[in-house]
Interface confidence: medium
């Protein structure tokens, strides 16, 4: 019979012969022959292959480098790579999450609406009327102005989105 020019799915052509590919999680040791099947071996502990393949070497699992702010989100298997994410307070610079950047701070006049996660940055919001933030922070929310009335005091200086109100004593009417 004529030697094949194309092979079925999960096969590859070598020496005019169709050999089975190695399944995910295994690497090629030797091609098949007229008399023997393809020989495959499982990947080592820190290695993986995620497709049907004829690779002679498995890929190394990604290293989540703590010095780049990375930690393991999902441990790799023989068929999947390790997935990294960022430590608290940082977020990924790309979808591949190869390094992390510090979450931004919210400037005075803005408060933290949502603390950042491993994949998303800090969300800031302007402090509405009645609230203020006088610092640059990645954690501080807008805080309500002090209520002078509850302290039996009066407002001496109005608050802004960046400053609290200033309370003072009530003017006593003299008899």
């Amino acid at each position: 019979p004529e030697p094949p020019t194309a092979c079925r799915e999960k096969q590859y052509l070598i020496n005019s012969q169709c050999c089975s590919l190695c399944q995910p999680g295994q690497k090629l040791v030797s091609d098949c022959t007229e008399f023997t099947e393809t020989e495959c071996l499982p990947c080592g502990e820190s290695e993986f292959l995620d497709t049907w393949n004829r690779e002679t070497h498995c890929h190394q699992h990604k290293y989540c480098d703590p010095n780049l702010g990375l930690r393991v989100q999902q441990k790799g298997t023989s068929e999947t790579d390790t997935i990294c994410t960022c430590e608290e307070g940082w977020h990924c610079t790309s979808e591949a999450c190869e390094s992390c950047v510090l979450h931004r701070s919210c400037s005075p006049g803005f408060g933290v609406k949502q603390i950042a996660t491993g994949v998303s940055d800090t969300i800031c919001e302007p402090c509405p009327v009645g609230f203020f933030s006088n610092v640059s922070s990645a954690f501080e929310k807008c805080h309500p102005w002090t209520s002078c009335e509850t302290k039996d005091l009066v407002v001496q200086q109005a608050g802004t989105n960046k400053t609290d109100v200033v309370c003072g004593p009530q003017d006593r009417l003299r008899a």
Epitope: L68, G69, V135
Partner: nanobody, 120 residues
């Protein structure tokens, strides 16, 4: 000159408690986010907890949530970390730091650290 001086570390049994302190000087303490980070033997730096300038807003790593409490006394320029229900995996050198502006290792200012050993 900026200085951060941690204290309060020591040897404690699993389940025990410790309170770490960090005395700060040389910068506007009450205007900065502050953090505690730790480094276990042979491991990288791990973010433990952070606190906003007013002290009203706090943030914890999942590994310490419900067990550790961060606080600050701006009148004393001091940062605290109350550690309860300590576990062997909490063994590390603990550092206080200004919240950094770059990658994890590039803290703008941080102290010499205090060693916490959890062992029976």
């Amino acid at each position: 000159e900026v200085q951060l001086l941690e204290s309060g570390g020591g040897l404690v049994q699993p389940g025990g408690s410790l309170r770490l302190s960090c005395a700060a000087s040389g910068f506007t303490f009450d205007g900065r986010d502050m953090v505690w980070v730790r480094q276990a033997p042979g491991k990288g730096l791990e973010w433990v907890s952070a606190i906003s300038p007013s002290g009203l807003d706090t943030y914890y790593a999942d590994s310490v949530k419900g067990r550790f409490t961060i606080s600050r006394d701006n009148s004393k320029n001091t940062l605290y970390l109350q550690m309860n229900s300590l576990r062997a995996e909490d063994t590390a050198v603990y550092y206080c730091a200004e919240r950094p502006q770059m990658l994890v290792t590039n803290f703008d200012y941080w102290g010499q650290g205090t060693l916490v050993t959890v062992s029976s």
